[in-house]
């Protein structure tokens, strides 16, 4: 069902004009008619789904609110080009408080940025550059601070397996001053929307609404969320069946936690609890030593029915990840555990996201991991 594509095209065509002035109305009505046409085209395959009916009713409401006629010109969807660098897409009246770097410079030097990522089976890179492989089945808090909350749901990659991967991701951007209303972003397997759950693509109706915005980089596969009011960039991808998450966030925001007992336990900050960690390096060493296809002693789970021989896994991972760092080792582990070649891409893109988001270029590759206590 392609209704989300219609939603994205409509929001793209009308971004920055929630309540267009009367002289904007013809253009807005043209965009609405295009939206209506798009939804009609999806009727056959979407007619039974909530998203379709929400769109249809939303269009009817907007048509009547703006006195749009059903007949008339339609608009061409805008080409999805990347926004230029800088703040050209932000409203000129966006208050300074809604641009983290500008407001931060008033009382300090350039902020220190940190990175956290979750990908594959899943592998976690914390804000302090610890690298862990975790079980964490079910719903877990990835980030929980005063500004946003990120929760992931991990499901077993194979029946009876301890190895899991991320099947659902929920991000709640909390209401913040005159910048943004509370916004919720939700992605699931085979549903990577380029909009918040309310259909919008920015922070709402406040002055600084465009200090939070979603950009679709690759339809259904790659979304970027910029939250400039907290100096934060989030990258969400669907790779194969599962989701990956990466974030760049200032230390000040990372540590903006009021209740350390409850909030401070989140995975990106503290890592996975010890009983949830998998010693994948031992697995890797065992695999290398034996070359065996099934490594029950070291494996965290029943091996996949169609896993790769060790040599094949190594070759496939080397192809995408020539540096034998922890991302490469994670790739090998995932192929041996799941037999799903898409995990190679998950590790590759996770490293690409580190290159884009990590502020310390000397720490792109991690080579050693200590299975230490969280915290």
């Amino acid at each position: 069902c392609k209704i989300l594509k219609c939603n994205s095209e409509f929001w793209s065509a009308t971004s920055g004009s929630h309540a267009p002035a009367s002289d904007d109305t013809p253009e807005f009505c043209a965009a609405l008619r295009s939206y209506a046409l798009c939804t009609r085209r999806t009727a056959r395959t979407c007619r039974g789904d909530l998203a379709y009916h929400s769109a249809v009713h939303g269009i009817e409401d907007l048509m009547s609110q703006h006195n749009c006629s059903k007949d008339g010109p339609t608009s061409q969807p805008r080409l999805r080009t990347l926004p230029p660098a800088g703040d050209s897409q932000e409203r000129s009246d966006s208050p300074e408080i809604c641009h983290y770097e500008k407001s931060f410079h008033k009382h300090s030097a350039t902020p220190n940025y940190t990175h956290c990522g979750l990908f594959g089976d899943p592998h976690l890179r914390t804000f302090t550059d610890r690298f862990q492989t975790c079980k964490v089945q079910g719903a877990w808090p990835l980030i929980d601070n005063n500004y946003l909350n990120v929760q992931v749901t991990n499901t077993p990659v194979l029946p009876g397996s301890a190895a899991t991967a991320t099947s659902k991701l929920t991000i709640i951007f909390k209401n913040f001053q005159e910048c943004v209303d509370q916004k919720v972003y939700q992605a699931e397997m085979d549903e990577l929307p380029a909009a918040f759950v309310d259909g919008s693509k920015n922070g709402g109706d406040k002055h600084g609404a465009n200090s939070l915005k979603i950009t679709e980089k690759v339809s259904g596969q790659h979304v970027e969320i910029q939250a400039k009011y907290i100096g934060t960039t989030i990258v969400v991808r669907q790779v194969g069946r599962y989701l990956t998450f990466a974030v760049r966030m200032p230390e000040e925001v990372v540590n903006a936690v009021e209740d350390w007992d409850s909030q401070g336990l989140y995975l990106c900050l503290r890592g996975c609890p010890l009983n949830q960690q998998i010693d994948f390096q031992a697995f890797h060493t065992n695999a290398e030593g034996t070359g065996a296809r099934r490594l029950a002693a070291a494996s965290p789970a029943p091996t996949a029915p169609e896993t790769f021989p060790y040599e094949t896994a190594v070759a496939k991972c080397k192809e995408k990840l020539p540096v034998e760092d922890l991302y490469y080792q994670a790739c090998v582990f995932d192929l041996l555990t799941t037999g799903d070649v898409n995990f190679t891409l998950a590790a590759y893109y996770a490293l690409e996201d580190v290159k884009m988001l990590h502020s310390n270029k000397d720490k792109l590759h991690l080579y050693e991991r200590t299975r230490d206590l969280p915290g």
Epitope: C1, L37, R40, R41, T42, R44, T45, C46, R47, G48, D49, L50, A51, Y52, H53, T155, S167, E188, M189, D190, E191
Partner: antibody, heavy 115, light 112 residues
């Protein structure tokens, strides 16, 4: 991971009734239309019918119209197929599938109608 | 009802070779503005069907790029560029343009 698990199948006599269930997980069940599809032994696939996300509309194949009823309970993430006046030609594996047009399918449940 | 006729009924190919199968509809499957709701499913032995291709040529999530769907109107083709062992099973075409929704009778792919 999207999972659909059918249950309630078995051996019944012609003319009797049976109610199948399909429990969904791994996606927001209440957002999606759902389908029932069947496959007679050693035969191809036959679409039975579909139900909208909110039960507002239901569509059926002519072969089951008036005898089969599709329903759902969104609070329980469960889809149902109530089958009345069963005939021998209704013997099949019954699958539930997610979406207005099916993408993910359950593993199926066998229904045998025989005297 | 729309009748979908699949040919051949069975197909035996060597691993690594190309396989091609056809699905012909009794009426046009074009819905509106060029949208054509024809899908392809694969049912592997002992398993439930899995979606491969939707809207004639779009690969579903996780489907390898060796599966190529094409066609328009009433004639559709599924090609597998390099057949692998896991590709064996029965391939069904399916149309969602007209009610009732209908399946083709299937093409069985076997490995030589």
């Amino acid at each position: 991971e999207v999972q659909l698990v059918e249950s309630g199948g078995g051996l019944v006599q012609p003319g009797s009734s049976l109610k199948l269930s399909c429990v969904a997980s791994g996606f927001t069940f209440s957002n999606y239309g759902m389908n029932w599809i069947r496959q007679a032994p050693k035969k191809g696939l036959e679409w039975i019918g579909m139900i909208y996300y909110d039960s507002s509309e239901k569509h059926y194949a002519d072969s089951v119209k008036g005898r089969f009823t599709i329903s759902r309970d969104n609070s329980k993430n469960t889809l149902y197929l109530e089958m009345n006046s069963l005939r021998s030609e209704d013997t099949a594996i019954y699958y539930c599938a997610k979406g207005t047009t099916p993408d993910y399918w359950g593993q199926g449940v066998m229904v045998t109608v025989s005297s | 009802d729309v009748v979908l006729t699949q040919t051949p009924v069975s197909l035996s190919v060597t691993l690594g070779d190309q396989a091609s199968m056809s699905c012909r509809s009794s009426q046009s499957l074009e819905y509106s503005d060029g949208y054509t709701f024809l899908e392809w499913f694969l049912q592997k032995p002992g398993q439930s069907p899995q979606l491969l291709i939707y809207e004639v040529s779009n690969r579903f999530s996780g489907v390898p790029d060796r599966f190529i769907g094409s066609g328009s109107g009433t004639d559709f083709t599924l090609k597998i560029s390099r057949v692998e062992p896991e590709d064996l099973g029965v391939y069904y075409c399916f149309q969602a343009t007209h009610d009732p929704l209908t399946f083709g009778s299937g093409t069985k792919l076997e490995i030589k």
